[in-house]
Interface confidence: medium
């Protein structure tokens, strides 16, 4: 259907509500650097235009694309030029350049520091005194620190942390409610944007059949039940939805997966018996519901895999014929059989039958050449298993912190050239596997390490991809999606490595450490890890063990010290001249 | 859930033609592999011709090919079996089967296919 005014189109289908906080979070992530006041005004009159073409279609300007109009909207900002440097350039172009060249002005890791909550009384007062606007506020400074976030799945998310004001702030002890509320909430946030980071890089760097691909191997093991036809059809309309989205369409993508939610309700009889208490939710809270649905149980009949894929006489003829057809219905059939393994697996398990029949079908005796590939998979399911287990043993050994420092030294000697606060980031949260995935049972185990490591490796890559620095990160990042993880794994020492210069500057500490938060204690702490190492390389585990033993002990006793900041100046050089003769 | 239904059987003499009918409710019909399959009196189910989903990719059996075709009407969701220079021991029930999900795999295997059809009789005789 054929609209006159796009704009009222989606102000239509959206709601106001809906429209303006899109807008609002639309306008955030292109111009991370402007302040709230700015974009609550751009998206206000935005709003007001957008009702004015609904109410009178023929409207002046109601006829433009969403880009032009968009556009337009951010070339109209005074600070363009001072604020953004070159991105003001992108005003000089026409559509569709002017969308593409704001897109690639989006900056992954702004700098800006990390969201301090005020006094539970003051968020109150100020939540009750305009909730609009302190909602608002909340999208705003989610959606500039994080520019690629899924801006349907934010609107979800303000209405979480609607709630939860609502409720901790009748509460007697309003900090005791909001804390550990607030705390998960931001927990799953975090999680949500590197998802959709992750997505995104998919859709960017490697393409619609990437991502395609992935999302079948998913919602296969999500909906074994449904047919792959079915799975076909909700795969084409949440690649669109997502394309919009990492596109900056949010009004689109915000429309277009409220439309697929309703298919699936409508259609939930073929595509798993799991949906229904979904289905009875408006629509955030529906969507969401369908996106983390638990998984259908396994039809009980499912013929084995070897009829088709290896003994059908026609196996050569199916896959000539289309191949990714034929592929899609292989990750699909072996998907739902597999819900204990990761996507990245089944997505490496369909490239190597793939590569084999490459291989087979351009021989004299195909069926004879690909009879074994089943049995060929076994290595590529060993590995990631493998590591798995290891890796949880370790968590288990040493708890997150320490883990995180294992993973720390591993990945610094993997590559040095990266930048320490990228080191620590991923490092963290690579750490944070294991806490999420170990306690699992053993049939989750692999899925949810996996997929998880592929979602961090993402953010190493897109870190890296700004400054680059590290071939052998360039390697990991670009050569394949599916084998980032296996590639960072693989890499050994960079021997080629040349030793940083020591500066004392970088161990110089100061008493304000004693009083910062557990979280930034370690990340200090980890941060002067990663320098230890980019110093001396080829430091030993148990060297640098007893230093970070000692520089433990020296942070405890000077935080306990009567002065302070004189036990730092004064012990702080020793610490670092005992550091240095204790790894030469 | 699939539901088939064949028509077109009949009696015919050596020589001539019929052409089968197979019409289906499945909204993704046409992304689907339907076959032929036909069963003489105390003989097993044999294969007769299949087509994939998506891309009409057509396979027959060696005792049909060059004699019968199989095509499809997407818009209409019915598969045809059209069938030249009929012979005695083409006499039998004839099948149309479907396999959901397997857009391109047409399958020899009768056990492979969860949806049949209730058959329609052709007979060859003079």
């Known amino acids: 259907e054929a609209y006159k005014s796009e704009i009222a189109h989606r102000y239509n289908d959206l709601g106001e509500e809906h429209f303006r906080g899109l807008v609002l979070v639309a306008f955030s992530q292109y111009l991370q650097q402007c302040p709230f006041e700015d974009h609550v005004k751009l998206a206000k009159e935005v709003t007001e235009f957008a009702k004015a073409c609904a109410a009178e279609e023929s409207g002046a300007n109601c006829d433009k694309s969403l880009h032009t109009l968009f556009g337009d909207k951010l070339c109209t900002v005074a600070s363009l030029r001072d604020k953004y440097g070159d991105m003001a350039d992108c005003c000089e172009k026409q559509e569709p350049d002017r969308n593409e060249c704001f897109l690639a002005h989006k900056d992954d890791n702004p700098g800006f520091p990390p969201l301090v909550a005020p006094e539970p009384d003051a968020l109150c007062a100020a939540f009750q005194d305009n909730e609009q606007l302190f909602l608002g506020k909340y999208l705003y400074e989610i959606a500039r620190r994080h520019p690629y976030f899924y801006a349907p799945e934010l609107l979800y998310y303000a209405q979480q942390y609607k709630g939860v004001f609502a409720e901790c702030c009748q509460a007697a002890d309003k900090a005791a409610c909001l804390g550990p509320k607030i705390e998960a909430l931001r927990e799953k946030v975090l999680l949500s944007s590197a998802k959709e980071r992750f997505k995104c890089a998919s859709l960017q760097k490697f393409g619609d059949r990437a991502f395609k691909a992935w999302s079948v191997a998913r919602l296969s093991q999500r909906f074994p039940k449904a047919d792959f036809a079915e799975i076909s059809k909700v795969v084409t309309d949440l690649t669109k939805v997502h394309k919009e989205c990492c596109h900056g369409d949010l009004l689109e993508c915000a429309d277009d997966r409220a439309d697929l939610a309703k298919y699936m309700c409508e259609n939930q009889d073929s595509i798993s018996t799991k949906l229904k208490e979904c289905c009875d939710k408006p629509v955030l809270e529906k969507s969401q519901c369908l996106a983390e649905v638990e998984r259908d149980e396994l039809p009980g009949d499912l013929p084995s895999l070897a009829a088709d894929f290896v003994e059908d006489k026609e196996v050569c003829k199916n896959y000539q014929e289309a191949k990714d057809v034929f592929l899609g219905t292989f990750l699909y059939e072996y998907a739902r059989r597999h819900p204990e393994y990761s996507v990245s697996l089944l997505l490496r398990l369909a490239k190597e039958y793939e590569a084999t029949l490459e291989k087979c079908c351009a021989t004299d005796d195909p069926p004879t050449c690909y009879a074994k590939v089943l049995d060929e998979f076994k290595p590529l399911v060993d590995e990631p298993q493998n590591l798995v287990k290891t890796n949880c043993e370790l968590f288990e050994k040493l708890g997150e912190y320490g883990f995180q420092n294992a993973l720390l030294v591993r990945y610094t000697k993997k590559a040095p050239q990266v930048s320490t606060p990228t080191l620590v980031e991923v490092s963290r949260k690579l750490g944070k596997v294991g806490t999420k995935c170990c306690k699992k049972p053993e049939s989750e185990r692999m899925s949810c390490a996996e997929d998880f490591l592929s979602v961090v490796l993402n953010r190493l890559c897109v870190l890296h991809e700004k400054t680059p620095v590290s071939e052998r990160v360039t390697k990991c990042c670009s050569e394949s999606l599916v084998n980032r993880r296996p590639c960072f794994s693989g890499l050994e020492v960079d021997e080629t490595y040349v030793p940083k210069e020591f500066n004392a500057e970088t161990f110089t500490f100061h008493a304000d450490l004693c009083t910062l938060p557990e979280a930034e204690k370690q990340v200090k702490k980890q941060t002067a890890l990663v320098e230890l190492l980019k110093h001396k390389p080829k430091a030993t585990d148990e060297q640098l063990k007893t230093v970070m033993g000692d520089f433990g002990a020296f942070v405890e006793k000077c935080c306990a010290a009567e002065n302070k900041e004189g036990c730092f100046s004064e012990e702080g050089p020793k610490l670092v001249a005992a550091a240095q003769a204790a790894l030469v | 859930e699939v539901q088939l239904l064949e028509s077109g059987g009949g009696l015919v003499q050596p020589g001539g033609s019929l052409r089968l009918s197979c019409a289906a409710s499945?909204?993704?019909?046409?992304?689907?592999?339907v076959a032929w399959f036909r069963q003489a009196p105390g003989k097993e189910r044999e294969f007769v011709a299949g087509?994939?989903?998506?891309?009409?990719?057509?396979y027959y059996a060696d005792s049909v090919k060059g004699r019968f075709t199989i095509s499809r009407d997407n818009s209409k969701n019915t598969l045809y079996l059209q069938m030249n220079s009929l012979r005695p021991e083409d006499t039998a029930v004839y099948y149309c089967?479907?396999?959901?999900?397997?857009?391109?795999?047409?399958?020899?295997?009768?056990?492979?296919?969860?949806?049949w059809g209730q058959g329609t009789l052709v007979t060859v005789s003079s």
């Open positions: 087509i994939g989903g998506g891309v009409d990719i057509t």
């Open positions: 089967a479907a396999r959901p999900g397997r857009p391109l795999i047409t399958s020899k295997v009768a056990d492979l296919y969860p949806y």
């Open positions: 499945y909204r993704y019909i046409d992304e689907t592999a």
